[in-house]
């Protein structure tokens, strides 16, 4: 039962994580205009992986897609690639893990097959989570570098008269969503790998050995240890924890999100 719970929880955590990675990838607020220590403007700029947006104080918002592939910074392309790889791996992992779930019966699938699938999906979730965390971290590093560069250039003007106040960008909501989602996917993947260990049938069954006593034709088979060692001729290797009432559908509650703005 503990393995089923671990596997089920790993699946749910990964599912939430991958949904978060998808949400982060689609969000426009990867970087937002830094308002601290800046002249107060009636226009607010924010940027995503796919488009940049401008919100006027009147409420009018205009977004423009990046309709070029070659003109974009290599780092942005790398972040896009990492996030997409993360989503694809996560999606495949989810598909595999659905069939690997112990509570779902598919034909006469062996436990060993389910264990392999659980491990595969677990590894996929781990890589997916790492891709998301890496993508978000690369973008965050890019922001920090640009922030300090623009801060250094901010007050450079002829004779102390500032002609252009450079727009500085800071971390947007998508970065935090991405970090949390990547972490959840990673944790879910680790849980799946742990569950796999419990699912795997032990292949160390001893074969029956005949002892021939001289002058007798009686065969002795070591069966006396069966109860204490757990080994024997039962190759189905039925687990003790597999019995009893199932508690896979335990209700999970999450704290509700309150935005105070």
């Amino acid at each position: 039962m503990a393995v089923t719970a671990c596997q089920g929880l790993g699946f749910v955590v990964s599912l939430i994580g991958i949904a978060g990675i998808i949400a982060a990838t689609c969000m426009d607020q990867w970087s937002t205009q830094d308002l601290y220590n800046n002249p107060v403007t009636a226009v607010f700029n924010y940027q995503g992986l796919w488009r940049s947006c401008v919100r006027e104080s009147s409420g009018f918002t205009e977004c423009r897609g990046y309709f070029t592939l070659l003109g974009l910074p290599a780092m942005l392309q790398a972040v896009r690639a990492l996030m997409i790889v993360g989503i694809v791996l996560g999606a495949i992992g989810l598909l595999v893990s659905i069939f690997a779930l112990k509570c779902i019966r598919i034909g006469s699938m062996e436990d060993s097959a389910k264990a392999n699938m659980t491990l595969t999906s677990g590894i996929m979730f781990i890589v997916s989570g790492l891709c998301a965390i890496a993508g978000v971290s690369v973008f965050a590093n890019m922001l920090v570098t640009n922030f300090w560069m623009s801060t250094a250039n901010m007050y450079t003007g002829m004779g102390g008269m500032v002609q252009t106040v450079q727009t500085r960008y800071t971390f947007g909501a998508a970065l935090f969503v991405g970090w949390v989602a990547g972490g959840l996917t990673l944790i879910g993947g680790v849980m799946m790998c742990i569950a796999c260990r419990g699912l795997a049938p032990e292949e160390t069954n001893y074969k029956a050995v005949s002892y021939h006593a001289s002058g007798h034709s009686v065969a002795y088979k070591p069966g006396g240890f069966k109860a204490s060692t757990g080994f024997g001729s039962n190759t189905k290797n039925k687990k003790i924890y597999d019995g009893g009432a199932r508690t896979e559908d335990e209700v999970q509650s999450y704290p509700s999100k309150h935005d105070y703005v």
Epitope: Q47, S52, E56, S58, T164
Partner: antibody
């Protein structure tokens, strides 16, 4: 059609307060900023502040912040601007205007309210 | 505060002639996010409230005759009346609507010769 109707002309003594009203009609009021500006005789325009109808968010020009109070009564679709500690240099035409949805500028204006400060 | 400087302070033009008004801001009104300059032109006729002619430096308000055009970006802007009409007699103001507090130029009075 969009209309902003302001209260009538006022004559005030120095040191007193004046409260100008601006009734909006012809559009969905919530989500629009109502601006307050003034124009002294023969002078240019000065922005005093703004209020976002529906949220109560207010921004003031720091030049007027200590003396001006902008409020709104959503039940009557009316915005108010109160200017205290009046001086003779506050004699001006006071305008309310609606901030348009594009460009952050003011697409509809009230007819103006002349406030004369005289002893 | 952003200082808006208009020139000339008054302009006398013959009917049918071109009138050009200049406006300079002390800081750039260009927003890097959408490459738009947040400058508005207003027309104020005697005894009336101002009327918006042009916003985003060059976008004409609906219903405004096409003889009015705006140009410029960053800190330097121009309002052009291609063929002056009698009804264009007014004071024209430019406004910074990028930085708070919003500020106006001192105005340019257009008169007919």
């Amino acid at each position: 059609q969009v209309q902003l109707v302001q209260s009538g002309a006022e004559v005030k003594k120095p040191g007193s307060s004046v409260k100008v009203s601006c009734k909006a009609s012809g559009y969905t009021l919530t989500g629009y900023w109502i601006e307050w500006l003034r124009q002294r005789p023969g002078q240019g325009l000065e922005w005093m502040g703004e209020i976002l109808l529906g949220s109560g968010s207010i921004k003031y020009n720091v030049k007027f912040k200590d003396r001006v109070t902008i409020t709104a009564d959503e039940s009557t679709s009316t915005a108010y601007m109160e200017l205290s500690s009046l001086r003779s240099e506050d004699t001006a035409v006071y305008y309310c205007a609606r901030k348009g949805l594009r460009g952050n500028s003011f697409d509809y204006w009230g007819q103006g309210t002349l406030v004369t400060v005289s002893s | 505060d952003i200082v808006m400087t208009q020139s000339p302070s008054s302009l006398t033009v013959s009917l049918g002639e071109k009138a050009t008004i200049s406006c300079k801001s002390s800081q750039s009104l260009l927003n890097s996010g959408n490459q738009k300059s947040y400058l508005t032109w207003y027309q104020q006729k005697p005894g009336q409230p101002p009327k918006r002619l042009i916003y985003w430096a060059s976008t004409r308000e609906s219903g405004v005759p096409d003889r009015f055009s705006g140009s410029g970006s960053g800190t330097d802007f121009t309002l052009t009346i291609s063929s002056l009409q009698a009804e264009d007699l007014a004071v024209y103001y430019c406004q910074n609507d990028y930085y708070y507090p919003f500020t106006f130029g001192q105005g340019t009075k257009v008169e007919i010769k």
